[in-house]
Interface confidence: medium
Amino acid sequence: ECVTQLLKDTCFEGGDITTVFTPSAKYCQVVCTYHPRCLLFTFTAESPSEDPTRWFTCVLKDSVTETLPRVNRTAAISGYSFKQCSHQISACNKDIYVDLDMKGINYNSSVAKSAQECQERCTDDVHCHFFTYATRQFPSLEHRNICLLKHTQTGTPTRITKLDKVVSGFSLKSCALSNLACIRDIFPNTVFADSNIDSVMAPDAFVCGRICTHHPGCLFFTFFSQEWPKESQRNLCLLKTSESGLPSTRIKKSKALSGFSLQSCRHSIPVFCHSSFYHDTDFLGEELDIVAAKSHEACQKLCTNAVRCQFFTYTPAQASCNEGKGKCYLKLSSNGSPTKILHGRGGISGYTLRLCKMDNECTTKIKPRIVGGTASVRGEWPWQVTLHTTSPTQRHLCGGSIIGNQWILTAAHCFYGVESPKILRVYSGILNQSEIKEDTSFFGVQEIIIHDQYKMAESGYDIALLKLETTVNYTDSQRPICLPSKGDRNVIYTDCWVTGWGYRKLRDKIQNTLQKAKIPLVTNEECQKRYRGHKITHKMICAGYREGGKDACKGDSGGPLSCKHNEVWHLVGITSWGEGCAQRERPGVYTNVVEYVDWILEKTQAV
């Protein structure tokens, strides 16, 4: 059962796992949600009736029954983890805490003009978890405007005290706002030296990498595969750090793999969602329950529905025993990972999918695409929307992409002559334009935000946001696409598609069925050669075949250039302009979305 509200002057008795310090009850609830075992918590607010050493304590709790006895206590605020809820969860915390000093290891001290600059510095520093900034009103002259970057083993403060004229806050890495470079490659036959901060068991290097990404102190990792010569170290995932944030040495070793935390581009990768099954693999851990199940998929469902289950092992039925049902062992551990991994015993293992909602919704796998053909099928491009104008009569105006539950990203040039958002309608989950009738539900547009440097499509800044009047409930047919990460400049996209209801040739009409075309990206240098009369800037990206034949066209404007990388779709471009349609040696020109991530986040995350 999902309980979101906080219980004032209430304390949960017993069930303590650990105590951390958080600046608010709201953040305590987030910490509890991200902790592998926490189901409930009690937070102590500052209060004259409470011992100041207990202020800001956040006690994380667990219970077999998923609840604990309640006791009245002034200044105590209790609640439940969001693990029991089905809604999206984010670790992003932009709050600034006034007159609070969050204690940790002060490893960097510098002068900053404002708390915002200090927070940006923390976000762009690989080690920084949170910061404290002494304002210009701070009593001690030599400490005024000092920005202290801090880290701890847990990522949360070791203590929080009241201190006048300072402000504190957290790194915004989990808000996708970091400039730190993302190295996505996993390096085979490589061991990274440097100090281990923790070790866990993992079935493969990908799970090891995801564990590293959400571990507060992990910057890179080394994973020993099941073929590693030393038996005791097989399936061991070593979480590592170094002063520079990078490995000091790479050692060539067979059967080991190494890689990096993807903390600064975690909004566009699955971090908590380990959806694979591991065949002939047994996960060991504390047993929660043993239930009969028809298949390993059914076993995973049982684990996902049991709030305390973290992973499972399924042993298929022997011949005709038990109506063909096998045994499903639901398990847990202190850190959410198996305590040991064994191979060759015939089990099928995997993880709960309950934590998938802690990843960005845009990382969810969508149904496999239909290869060949140009017409799309339902649910193939669930982020694609059709934007209609109702003036003078209703018609398709442009494409667009869902990037958040209240936000559509599209092209600025679509709004030439549009006087008011009132005449706009956004339809999502649509395959055929003919589905749109008088009574078809749509989203009204509350606000059109056009980039303030936009003049015309050909000169760039062809980007706009639509804020919807109501929120989109995500389903298989309408869900967001991930934005590319700022730190992700090394990704080379090879699987890119342009979609829309636009013309199929220059003189044509809007298509009924959503069309798709696979199109290769073209370097800006090559693109510039094809458009001598224009300036192809780094804020544009081009795509097209040299011989032409496939391209976006009139009516596709504002729609997505979607590229798949590591099973996740990214909104790489927005259909903007081109010379004719699908002409030989005339690639389509798209708005290069990665160059506008800051602008998008600034507009969509404005308080």
Epitope: N179, L180, A181, S244, L246, S248, R489
Partner: nanobody, 122 residues
Framework: QVQLVESGGGLVQPGGSLRLSCAAS????????MAWFRQAPGKGLEGVSL????????SYTDSVKGRFTISRDNSKNTLYLQMNSLRAEDTAVYYC???????????????WGQGTLVTVSS
């Protein structure tokens, strides 16, 4: 203390090549990363390429991928930027920077050279 001195800038025609060098001296082994940044007239600082000093990881910004190559000669304590197929929009003052973070943010670099001007024009 670390000192960085760039050289190799100059005037070059579109399509031409240049090789920038950055000689580092002082306490350089404390630096986790080195980078080339550039500042075009009237624009802000833009990251061009990064290199991790010990492990050699490299990253390029989109607009220079396939044209520029960053490298480092540890024995000479020198960082290089080989620039091919130069375009007018590459015109800028190029700065070499050293710091402890592998980052695109200029604020992550504590040490900077004085800059070398690259002009691409016919």
């Amino acid at each position: 203390q670390v000192q960085l001195v760039e050289s190799g800038g100059g005037l070059v025609q579109p399509g031409g090549s240049l090789r920038l060098s950055c000689a580092a001296s002082g306490y350089t082994y404390s630096m986790g990363a080195m980078a080339w940044f550039r500042q075009a007239p009237g624009k802000g600082l833009e990251g061009v390429s990064l290199i991790a000093t010990s492990s050699g990881f490299i990253s390029y910004t989109d607009s220079v991928k396939g044209r520029f190559t960053i490298s480092r000669d540890n024995s000479k304590n020198t960082l290089y930027l080989q620039m091919n197929s130069l375009r007018a929009e590459d015109t800028a003052v190029y700065y070499c920077a050293a710091g402890t973070q592998f980052s695109w943010s200029p604020g992550s670099y504590n040490y900077w050279g004085q800059g070398t001007l690259v002009t691409v024009s016919s």
